[in-house]
């Protein structure tokens, strides 16, 4: 199985959760895209765009927005207000079965925690941006998890320095977290794909 | 190893037609679309259209200045790109490399090496 | 169409200096903070080389003495410590819209 490094990200409650996938296929444009958790081994379905995916037209499940742009290969997440409950690994996909999914990125490990007492972050409409880039050929089921970087939601007018492959980039006010992770290369993701692909359609014509 | 290869390139009277070709090989070449970008002797680069893959219809798209004269079409069986280039003018003398994206709208990362097309009486 | 203006349009710089070029355009290339805007490199009888993509990110072999910021319509190239290889024309280009576009170059030379 092709090893997947989780990210771990940490909220309050009340927090919003914001995650650009990028998916860059053509070949994905199309497609239903779709954002789930992990719960043990199986990923429960908890947002999917419509098929065919039209651009920047919003899909709402309860505090779920999902909003595709198809012509441009990226697809935005938002998990509105936050609660302990919603802690747990999610993976944005491209969905074509249930069983079927492709993994688009490393999952996120979300951890939502109680805003302390006193501190009027706690039920705060803050906004953490996570981009996300495909880095993986793993099917949604059963990859093998590495030990989680962990990035914390920082105070007002701090900054955060996130690590990417040949830069640093200094964030103020966590407006962006980019992360660009290469795994292995786009090529083998895209031969990766194109073969399932080719076996799903031999399999169902 | 990713490779993009032009050909066709020559000496046309003005109102003359010429193809190029763009061979690829290296990657699955169904998967992206592909660009036409030229560079007349001396100046900056133009882009000068591209063409998407079969999941969008072979979608094309094209610069101003040779909108209705120029077509690009691509053969996924041969691996091929092609520029068809119609009424040509003498402001289309240029190098004309072909070029292939990293995906929906991303930056192009391989290059031919370019093919010279001159158009002269 | 957007229009990319790069400034200077010719720059000399001393060898270990800091050379910088701005690439403005006419509307913003962004899409989901997502900006569109790429930078190469080229030098004479080759074709362009791609050193910079989607703004900031350093594409993959290329030297991290070169950098990219900037977002919406204002983007900078940088060069932190100029080298002889670095002599060449740089160009910006936008994929955001079409049809693409490129800036008119800046020339980069040794002082």
């Known amino acids: 199985t092709t090893e997947l490094t989780e990210e771990k990200y940490e909220y309050k409650e009340g927090q919003t959760l914001e995650v650009k996938c990028d998916y860059t296929l053509e070949k994905f444009a199309s497609s239903q895209k779709a954002w789930q958790k992990m719960e043990g081994k199986m990923p429960k379905i908890l947002a999917k765009t419509e098929r065919p995916s039209k651009n920047s037209h919003p899909v709402q499940v309860g505090r779920i927005t999902l909003e595709d742009y198809p012509d441009h290969g990226l697809l935005q997440v938002q998990m509105t207000n936050l609660q302990v409950e919603d802690s747990g690994l999610y993976q944005c996909v491209i969905y074509q079965h249930p069983k079927e999914s492709h993994v688009l990125f490393n999952p996120i490990c979300l951890v939502v925690t109680k805003g302390s007492s006193g501190t009027p972050g706690s039920s705060e409409n803050s906004t953490q941006n996570v981009y996300r880039t495909p880095s993986t050929t793993a099917k949604a089921l059963g990859p093998r998890y590495t030990s989680p970087r962990t990035v914390t939601q920082a105070p007002p007018e701090s900054t955060v320095v996130v690590s990417t492959p040949g830069s640093e980039i200094n964030l103020t006010n966590v407006t962006d977290i980019i992360r660009e992770q290469k795994l292995i290369s786009e090529e083998d993701l895209e031969q990766k794909l194109i073969s399932e692909e080719d076996l799903h359609h031999h399999h169902h014509h | 190893e990713v490779q993009l290869v032009e050909s066709g390139g020559g000496l046309v009277q003005p109102g003359g037609s010429l193809k190029l070709s763009c061979a690829a090989s290296g990657f699955t070449f169904s998967t992206y679309a592909m660009h036409w970008v030229r560079q007349a002797s001396g100046k900056g680069l133009e882009w000068v259209g591209r063409?998407?893959?079969?999941?969008?219809?072979?979608?094309?798209y094209y610069a101003a200045s040779v909108k209705g004269r120029f077509t690009i079409s691509r053969d996924d069986s041969k691996n091929t790109a092609y520029l068809q280039m119609n009424s040509l003018k003498t402001e289309d003398t240029a190098v004309y490399y072909c070029?292939?994206?990293?995906?929906?709208?991303?930056?192009?990362?391989?290059w031919g090496q370019g093919t010279l097309v001159t158009v002269s009486s | 169409d957007i229009v990319l203006t790069q400034s200077p349009d010719s720059l000399a710089v001393s060898l270990g200096e800091r050379a910088t070029i701005n690439c403005r355009a006419s509307e913003s290339v962004d899409t989901f903070d997502y900006s569109f805007l790429h930078w190469y490199q080229q030098k004479p009888g080759q074709p362009p080389k791609l050193l910079i993509y989607?703004?900031?990110n350093l594409e993959s072999g290329v030297p991290d003495r070169f950098s990219g910021s900037g977002s919406g319509t204002d983007f900078t190239l940088t060069i932190s410590s100029l080298q002889a290889e670095d002599v060449a024309v740089y160009y910006c280009?936008?994929?955001?819209?079409?049809?693409?576009?490129f800036g008119q170059g800046t020339k980069l030379e040794i002082k």
């Open positions: 063409i998407r893959t079969k999941s969008s219809n072979y979608a094309t």
């Open positions: 989607r703004a900031s």
């Open positions: 070029t292939r994206d990293m995906g929906i709208r991303r930056q192009f990362a391989y």
């Open positions: 280009q936008q994929s955001n819209e079409d049809p693409y576009t």
